[in-house]
């Protein structure tokens, strides 16, 4: 029960006090008691409940005609059952007794009022009056947890605007309101109560730039909402009529959790006594609601796809046809960014990551825009953000970034359990160097901090700086599976490729050619690949780098070897001994449910079939997956990327609610 104020009573004159329903009010009956008195009794109006405890140990007893010793160990508390119809209509009489004096009476006139700030603390999507039974001042995680949730209003419901909805002080329409969380102030007071009292809604100065509160005029259009709290206004005096009244507020978050902001925002209503014009206003009561800002959540490959994104560039029509066919099979919407908008930047995966935010009443996809800012720079903000599609970005917008800040270097695992600890939304994965040096690359600290601060998908740092491009999607992917953990981790594997090629040579296919059918590309015989000492050394190094990540992933995702599939792949070390795929990198695939768009490797054709394709199909088809091999050689592969790098996917949010987990 909420804490009320302390009321001191004195026999000299009647005391007038306000008691808010649902609060426990301490009654000080000792400090002004007549000197010769040694005991007391209390009588109260039917609407007042008096509790007397004499301790230690405390013996609780509801008031009756009993007398109690007048000593500091006696605690008297009041609660009120109903709101007063008029000021001071509830009475408490304290009678003091002494051995030689007649009883001395002290009178307390109480006004019972109902003041409660309600939000969806039970996370049902509805605001129910709490009557202060639950403590709204704490926010707890888990299925039995409580606490309200706020969305960053980061979409753009007004198509004529270039800004996010949370960047203005206006409520556009009912669509805009739905992105906000409802908070209701319920009051029930005597008619004249607010002539001597005032209510103030306020937020801590440290949080005022993270939230905006609009007050709605009941029964009127949403356009009648006016801003009452926000970056410029930490407090607002409310004009509340006496009697029974409800006031609605709509609350939007302005910032995602981050290093300097844990994501919690407390809104407080304070009842002030303004009866004495000569004195400052005095606080009578406070009620608070704590909101947590919903984190940005990534979706893994195991979530059903809803929309596929790709770029139209010079001569990639065949690639787009293949992606279109795949999207149709997976029943996905397809969005193509035209040449004039992508400015020859085809790397859709690198520009953005599509996740979502969720409150009990609303779920919103949100695009996380990387700071790489190449030709696709405007695409997330101009073409993806919109009505019910949010936007967030982090990191320096001009310079100071590396290739590891592109979002091919940002992935998320499916849900996992690691040594008893559950990650029901999976874990974020990004690449890094194995140790910092002047020239090592790492994801910008601002991005790392943002990802960690979301709390619900605890990030894992992998080692990817050994790659020329340096992205985790160059050596790993996840695909759905019907058994075990519900997925498989795919890892690029030089060892597996050498084994396959050796088997083919042993069967007499040493003359079979890699890159057959590719114009202007020197074809390589299996036997020459197997005998090339330098290539072996390069791939031995690559294997060590991937194996380091393999062990890291097994440990941090709780995987067994049987959860991992090795995809045959060779690499070569190029400039400054950084690795690039030797042939199209098959692990860099587009996963649309059970439909996979895999870079066509142009492997040696044996008995009419590419042995690399055949091997991959034999590994993935038993899981119910369908493999489509897409020719990306000249349009993507030779430009240091593949199918996954050139596409992006919006996926269905998890059915699991993030607030039900315990980070």
């Amino acid at each position: 029960m909420a804490q009320g104020t302390l009321i001191r009573v004195t026999p000299e004159q009647p005391t007038h006090a306000v008691c808010v329903l649902g609060t426990l009010t301490q009654l000080d009956i000792c400090s002004s008691a007549p000197e010769d008195c040694t005991s007391f009794s209390i009588n109260a109006s039917p609407g007042v409940v008096v509790d007397i405890a004499h301790g230690p140990p405390a013996k609780k007893k509801s008031t009756g005609s009993s007398t109690w010793p007048l000593d500091p160990g006696v605690e008297v508390t009041l609660t009120m059952k109903v709101a007063s119809g008029s000021t001071g209509d509830q009475k408490v009489q304290i009678s003091y007794y002494g051995p030689k004096t007649p009883p001395v009476k002290a009178l307390l006139y109480l006004t019972g009022v109902e003041i409660s700030l309600c939000a969806d603390i039970t996370r049902t999507g509805k605001v129910k009056p709490t009557r202060a039974v639950k403590d709204q001042r704490t926010w707890t995680w888990g299925p039995c947890g409580q606490g309200a949730i706020l969305l960053v209003n980061c979409d753009r419901d007004n198509l004529e605007s270039s800004a996010m909805d949370c960047e203005d002080d206006e409520v556009l329409d009912s669509e805009d309101l739905q992105d906000m969380s409802l908070m209701t102030l319920s009051t029930k007071t005597p008619k004249d109560f607010f002539t001597n009292h005032t209510l103030v809604l306020h937020v801590a100065r440290s949080e005022m730039d993270k939230v905006r509160v609009f007050q709605a005029t009941r029964g009127k259009l949403s356009s009648k909402c006016s801003v009452v709290l926000g970056p410029k206004w930490p407090s607002h005096y409310l004009m509340v009529p006496g009697g029974k009244h409800n006031m609605d507020f709509y609350v939007e978050a302005l910032a995602f959790p981050d290093t300097d902001f844990p994501g919690l925002i407390t809104l407080t209503i304070s009842l002030l006594d303004t009866s004495n014009l000569e004195l400052p206003e005095a606080v009578v009561f406070q009620d608070s609601v704590v909101f947590r800002v919903a984190p940005w959540i990534m979706t893994p490959n195991t979530q059903p796809p809803q929309e596929v994104y790709a770029c139209s560039i010079f001569e990639n029509e065949d690639f787009l046809k293949s992606v279109t066919t795949l999207a149709m099979k997976a029943k996905c919407k397809l969005t193509i960014c035209p040449e004039e908008e992508n400015m020859d930047d085809q790397w859709m995966q690198d520009e953005m990551e599509i996740g979502y935010i969720q409150a009990p009443h609303k779920t919103l996809p949100v695009v996380f825009d990387s700071p790489r800012n190449r030709g696709l720079k405007e695409f997330p903000i101009k073409r993806v953000m919109g009505p019910d599609f949010g936007y967030v970005t982090r990191g320096p917008q001009t310079g100071g970034i590396s290739g590891l800040d592109s979002f091919g270097n940002l992935e998320v695992s499916p849900p996992v359990t690691v040594r008893g600890k559950e990650y029901p939304l999976g874990r974020i994965l990004f690449g890094d160097s194995c140790y910092p040096s002047n020239d090592s690359r790492q994801m910008h600290q601002a991005l790392q901090d943002f990802l960690s601060a979301q709390q619900v998908q605890a990030p894992v740092k992998l080692y990817s700086d050994w790659l020329s491009v340096g992205h985790v999607d160059e050596f790993l992917s996840f695909v759905p599976a019907p058994d075990r953990k519900g997925f498989r981790l795919l890892l690029a594997s030089p060892r597996s490729c050498y084994k396959l090629f050796q088997e083919q040579q042993n069967e007499g296919h040493g003359e079979a050619l890699l890159f057959e059918g590719i114009k202007k590309k020197k074809q390589q015989k299996i036997k020459n690949i197997l005998s090339n000492k330098t290539l072996r050394e390069h791939n031995s190094f690559v294997e060590r780098c991937i194996d380091w990540n393999r062990e890291l992933l097994k440990r941090e995702l709780g995987l067994a070897e049987s959860d991992i599939i090795d995809i045959p792949q060779l690499f070569k070390l190029k400039e400054f001994s950084k690795a690039e795929a030797f042939f199209p990198n098959m692990v860099n695939m587009l996963v649309l449910g059970k439909h996979l768009g895999i870079p066509k490797p142009f492997g040696p054709v044996i008995n009419g079939r590419c042995c690399l394709e055949e091997k991959v199909c034999s590994l993935l088809e038993p899981l119910g997956l369908q493999c489509t091999f897409i020719n990306d050689f000249f349009t993507y592969h030779i430009r240091h990327g593949e199918v996954h790098c050139g596409t992006n996917v919006r996926r269905k949010p998890f059915s699991f609610k993030w607030w039900n987990m315990v980070p």
Epitope: K522, T534, K574
Partner: antibody, heavy 128, light 111 residues
């Protein structure tokens, strides 16, 4: 084979800035890494900076790190060296260098560590 | 002071052989096979003549050869010709924070 032409050199005061450009002709620069090498008057060669062909990583010499920035604009077939907080000891001829076309062999080790193609250089003089 | 050490000058008569040494450390020449050699005539840009210790770019005469032993790389020019008179610089990848180091240069005089 690619030909490289440097520009943007000149006289600048200590603490000032200059932006050198390296334009390519005869081939697409996006297929090549680019390094800047400098040579102070009457002195030896000093490696300055590098950007890879994929434009995914850069390297700098200790002497210029934090002051110089290498970048490339593949659409313009040009690589830039932005030089800030210039000092007298930065006075030199700045050469833009690159690699020869990749031999389409199984593997070509050592790329980036040696410079096949050199421009004629542009002189940067830092003096008050 | 350059990171890789070369003799200031060497000389030889036409038809003779000369060898220019380039001494580094275990963290550069000794560790990597990424040693290259450049020839620079006065007023001209340098030209690559050896890479990866001993490989020659096309167009470079086979009179130029490279080798490495321990922390020292060497450039040998056999059958010296007048046009070989120039400055020669060695270079190596390094594990230090500057990833490519040059020698101070050697002036070759053809007598």
């Amino acid at each position: 084979q690619v030909q490289l032409v440097e520009s943007g050199g000149g006289l600048v005061k200590p603490g000032g800035s200059l932006r050198l450009s390296c334009a390519a002709s005869g081939s697409t620069l996006s297929d090549y890494f680019v390094s800047w090498i400098r040579q102070a008057p009457g002195k030896g060669l000093e490696w300055v900076s590098f950007v890879n062909s994929a434009n995914t990583f850069t390297y700098y010499a200790d002497s210029v790190r934090g002051r110089f920035t290498i970048s490339r604009d593949n659409a313009k077939n040009t690589v830039y060296l932005q030089m800030n907080s210039l000092r007298a000891e930065d006075t030199a001829v700045y050469y833009c260098t690159s690699d020869a076309p990749e031999v389409d062999d199984i593997v070509a080790p050592g790329r980036g560590y040696y410079m096949d193609v050199w421009g004629r250089g542009t002189l940067v003089t830092v003096s008050s | 002071q350059s990171a890789l050490t070369q003799p200031r000058s060497v000389s030889g008569s036409p038809g003779q052989s000369v060898t220019i040494s380039c001494t580094g450390t275990r963290g550069d020449v000794g560790r990597y096979n990424h040693v290259s050699w450049y020839q620079q005539h006065p007023g001209k840009a340098p030209k690559l003549i050896i890479y990866n210790v001993y490989e020659r770019p096309s167009g470079v005469p086979d009179r130029f050869s490279g080798s490495k032993s321990g922390n020292t790389a060497s450039l040998t020019i056999s059958g010296l010709q007048a046009e070989d008179e120039a400055d020669y610089y060695c270079s190596s990848h390094s594990r230090s924070s500057t990833p490519v180091l040059f020698g101070g240069g050697t002036k070759l005089t053809v007598l």
